[in-house]
């Protein structure tokens, strides 16, 4: 594809030299490269009051390339833009700016949040959790026999972790007291199967958070399970402060 060209460039650079350095096809002592060897990109770099032509294998940061039939040319992106598709559309902003729909912004618009890793404005993502799984069998110290009052647990999964400004995740574990008909354990039995049992149901769709007490349990000593529950609650309070996802709750 031939281009019809103005001749001004030649007149502006009368001392055109053919013995050029670094990828130049034609050059001048005063202005450096005037044209490049095939496949190289021509860039005008400002040095003081002078503009020097340089030939590069690809456009530098802050420029985008256009492959014309007769010249591969680099054009400057907007001042706040590091990488761009063209003058109108930035694809990566300079440090301290956030990319939003091809523009570089100091702050993200309302309803969006800054992703400090990608330096883009992104939609706020709230936590999403699955439905509760069924309650586990009533157990005590890992057994399903040899007791009357025990605990049962149910869990749910985090389907979508929240972004920085998103709503935190609700608890993903719930434990509550349960009562079963006491059944003697057979020798060596740990009793994996669920039993017929009466349940103390939590309030309509909600569950009271409480540190497990020993009331109604066979031993007044703190069980490992209760210790674990206490630790999990402490952990959760710390996580709440850190604005992290909450994951465990104990209900009686």
């Amino acid at each position: 594809q031939n281009a019809s060209r103005g001749r001004r460039q030649r007149r502006m650079h009368p001392n055109v030299s053919q013995g050029c350095q670094g990828g130049c096809a034609t050059c001048s002592d005063y202005n450096g490269c005037l044209s490049c060897k095939p496949r190289l990109f021509f860039v005008l770099e400002r040095i003081g009051m002078k503009q020097i032509g340089v030939c590069l294998s690809s456009c530098p940061s802050g420029y985008y390339g256009t492959r014309y039939p007769d010249i591969n040319k680099c054009t400057k992106c907007k001042a706040d833009c590091d990488t761009c598709f063209n003058k109108n559309f930035c694809t990566k902003c300079k440090s301290g700016f956030y990319l939003h729909l091809g523009k570089c912004l100091d702050n993200c618009p309302e309803g969006l949040e800054a992703n400090n890793h990608t330096m883009e404005c992104v939609n706020i993502v709230h936590c999403e959790v699955s439905e509760w799984n069924p309650w586990s069998p009533c157990t005590k110290k890992g057994k399903t026999c040899g007791f009357k009052r025990g605990t049962e647990t149910r869990v749910r999964e985090i389907m979508q972790h929240p972004s920085a400004k998103g709503n935190l995740c609700p608890p993903t574990n719930e434990t509550r007291k349960c009562t079963v008909q006491r059944k003697k354990c057979q020798k060596g039995e740990r009793g994996k199967k669920g039993r017929e049992r009466k349940r103390k149901k939590p309030n309509k769709g909600e569950s009271k958070e409480a540190i497990p007490d020993s009331k109604g349990l066979e031993s007044s000593k703190e069980t490992p399970e209760q210790r674990e529950n206490k630790q999990q609650q402490k952990k959760r309070k710390v996580q709440d402060k850190q604005q992290k996802s909450v994951s465990v709750s104990t209900v009686h």
């Epitope: 594809q1 060209r5 492959r67």
Partner: antibody
Framework: EVQLVESGGGSVQPGRSLKVSCAAS????????MAWVRQAPKKGLEWVAT????????YYRDSVKGRFTLSRDNTKSTLCLQMDSLRSEDTATYYC?????????WGQGIMVTVSS | DIQMTQSPASLSASLGETVSIECLAS??????LVWYQQKSGKSPQLLIY???RLQDGVPSRFSGSGFGTRFSLKISGMQPEDEADYFC?????????FGAGTKLGLK
């Protein structure tokens, strides 16, 4: 608001000439390469020609080379396409567009009919 | 010149349906691909640039993907206002070339 307004279309006989113009506003005209893209009735888009931002270089598709001449006046923010030796296959809606790798801004288009 | 092969030539979709349009380049064009939407009797409008980046004002149900020679435009949940012609264009080098277009209709 960016506006590109084409004018000068119409019906001509094969072999005759026609000049279509485009008046630009709402953006820095002298910063942009400008192009014409055409669309034959019920057909796809076809790039016709581009003139670079300062007017020093023009590029044409093979089928119009030697017949069409593209020029611009940055002081008036106008673009002109002089079409000579028109053929029936030049019948199309001609769009004026700001060309910066993609065609970011488009005019509403002007119909050119070449028919005997 | 780089040839752009677009498919399908036409398709119709029900409201809410997900639609995909493909574009194939005859040589590697990196991510230098643009998608345009042209509604009946109107001029084309830039929809997606750099293969996957949405132009300001374009609904988020539109998305673009691909790199090299294979590209696609997806509409997740067809809306009445999406009824239009869609064109891909390689912006890798001159001459700029377009796909033949896809006419998207509403069932």
């Amino acid at each position: 608001e960016v506006q590109l307004v084409e004018s000068g279309g119409g019906s001509v006989q094969p072999g005759r000439s026609l000049k279509v113009s485009c008046a630009a506003s709402g953006f820095t005209f002298s910063d942009y390469d400008m192009a014409w893209v055409r669309q034959a009735p019920k057909k796809g888009l076809e790039w016709v020609a581009t003139i670079i931002y300062d007017g020093s270089r023009t590029y044409y598709r093979d089928s119009v080379k030697g017949r069409f001449t593209l020029s611009r006046d940055n002081t008036k923010s106008t673009l002109c396409l002089q079409m000579d030796s028109l053929r029936s296959e030049d019948t199309a809606t001609y769009y004026c567009a700001a060309h910066d790798r993609s065609f970011d801004y488009w005019g509403q288009g002007i119909m050119v009919t070449v028919s005997s | 010149d780089i040839q752009m092969t677009q498919s399908p030539a036409s398709l119709s979709a029900s409201l809410g349906e997900t639609v995909s349009i493909e574009c194939l380049a005859s040589e590697d064009i990196s991510n230098d691909l643009v998608w345009y939407q042209q509604k009946s009797g109107k001029s084309p409008q830039l929809l997606i640039y750099a293969a996957s980046r949405l132009q300001d004002g374009v609904p988020s149900r539109f998305s673009g993907s691909g790199f090299g020679t294979r590209f696609s435009l997806k509409i997740s949940g067809m809306q009445p206002e999406d009824e239009a012609d869609y064109f891909c264009q390689q912006s890798y080098k001159y001459l700029p070339t377009f796909g033949a277009g896809t006419k998207l209709g509403l069932k």
